[in-house]
Interface confidence: low
């Protein structure tokens, strides 16, 4: 059994934990319908640009179909996943499966997300995961709003090979990409991590029913959620331990792809979809 929540971040460096201002943080407010309409052409282009992405998507698509076929028997199980929320489409499920699969995709994707916000031009011309970014963002929004009442979660995240340094006590920070965490303390500690996070998240959504590894009780946190550093300690031999509490959200970008496509010639009106 693989433990992807830690394995998805296999780096070996020290990194500043701050507002991650170079990360691409679009929330697609007012342009979800337009983005959805743009997906077929956009995804087709991105498949051509990245074989890892294309392969992961096809594998995830097969897995999604298999899970859909098994849905009737799951509905009888005591540990059955909740039905998808209103508005949740096949491609949301496929995107979550593709992201959580034990393949190089999540690593490539998050590395790209962390850099894609350097400039609008960088996102538009050099970020080849626009489809995946949108689908994951929308999936988390749908899964989050599908919780009744909306819920915050205490989660745990172990990162192997990467030590985070908080900007300072009580600093406001973001995680910089999509961050996988677990409702189970033990799952996050599985690898003898270099950084251990305890996180109170309100925008992260449980994705157990949509993960390749449902046993992990995974929660996925979007890149635009902001946190306050509550406590940070770093022992000489042990892991860095960082405790974060949800503050809210912050995005530098909104609807950049649609603005570029639709708003070059004249005024642009984004809907509230």
């Amino acid at each position: 059994q693989s433990h992807p929540i830690t394995r998805r971040d296999l780096f070996s460096q020290e990194i500043q934990l701050d507002m991650a201002l170079a990360s691409f943080d679009d929330q697609y407010a007012g342009c979800a319908a337009a983005m959805t309409a743009a997906l077929p052409d956009l995804n087709h282009t991105e498949f051509q640009a990245n074989q890892v992405y294309a392969d992961s998507w096809t594998l995830a698509s097969s897995q999604w179909q298999e899970r859909q076929a098994r849905w009737p028997e799951w509905s009888l199980s005591p540990t059955r996943p909740s039905p998808p929320p209103l508005g949740f489409r096949d491609e949301h499920g496929v995107a979550l499966l593709a992201y959580t699969a034990n393949s190089p995709l999540h690593k490539e994707f998050n590395a790209a997300v962390r850099e894609a916000g350097r400039s609008r031009a960088h996102y538009l011309h050099h970020f080849s995961f626009k489809t995946l970014h949108f689908l994951l963002t929308e999936a988390l929004q749908l899964l989050g709003s599908g919780q009744r009442p909306p819920r915050c979660h205490q989660v745990f995240r172990g990162v192997h090979g990467l030590r985070f340094r908080p900007a300072g006590p009580r600093a406001t920070v973001r995680l910089g990409g999509f961050a996988s965490a677990s409702l189970k303390h033990v799952a996050a500690q599985q690898f003898g991590e270099d950084t251990f996070f305890g996180i109170w998240t309100c925008l992260g959504a449980p994705i157990k029913g949509y993960s390749f590894f449902p046993g992990e009780e995974e929660v996925l946190i979007p890149p635009f959620e902001t946190f306050q550093v509550i406590n940070a300690s770093r022992l000489a031999q042990g892991p860095a331990r960082i405790y974060l509490r949800a503050l809210g959200k912050h995005s530098t970008y909104n609807c950049e792809y649609i603005k570029d496509k639709k708003c070059k010639s004249g005024p642009c009106h984004l809907d509230n979809s």
């Epitope: 997906l39 498949f47 096809t58 179909q65």
Partner: antibody, heavy 117, light 106 residues
Framework: QVQLQESGPGLVKPSETLSLTCTVS????????WSWIRQPAGKGLEWIGR???????NYNPSLKSRVTMSVDSSKNQFSLKLSSLTAADTAVYYC???????????WGLGTMVTVSS | EIVLTQSPGTLSLSPGERATLSCRAS???????LAWYQQKPGQAPRLLIY???SRATGIPDRFSGSGSGTDFTLTISRLEPEDFAVYYC???????FGPGTKVDIK
Amino acid sequence: QVQLQESGPGLVKPSETLSLTCTVSGGSISSYYWSWIRQPAGKGLEWIGRISTSGFTNYNPSLKSRVTMSVDSSKNQFSLKLSSLTAADTAVYYCARDGWGRVFDIWGLGTMVTVSS
Amino acid sequence: EIVLTQSPGTLSLSPGERATLSCRASQSVSSSYLAWYQQKPGQAPRLLIYGASSRATGIPDRFSGSGSGTDFTLTISRLEPEDFAVYYCQQYGSSTFGPGTKVDIK
């Protein structure tokens, strides 16, 4: 523009293995998925399987035990092997390019395969 | 496994008339995963519509697709002589095809 051409034997004996090749011209085979689809005379279309240029395969569950696909990027070709043939495998076999998701945007002309002793 | 049913099996119309073809899925299908193809005798199928309503490159605007959930429709606003053919819908999450609707000349 991209064109696809199927090649292989028109007649195969029952219990033998069918081998077909699809040659892609007018463009690179790289960065796409490539599928095989068949159509018995007067009937509908049945997807057989797909392969990526990195060798990732995905087969129709009903045919999975008999299907093997491979790709040779240097020759811009991909191939299908279908084993343990019966008369029910008699059909026109098409190769096609997989576009976004799994939509087939470019097709070969098709090749007729008859399984008979 | 999702099963697609097409109706009618055969549609007999005259050139200039409007054709409405139906495709029904046994369970809900994302509209992003439904396509339509046209096949003429002795030829390979040709992609017409993907994502339920987006026309493929080079397809005339008399062809349009609509629908969501389990019910999808292909409409040919004014039949041209070259439009008489068999039309297949496809759920391309699992690469399943419908049995086809034949549009022939009345």
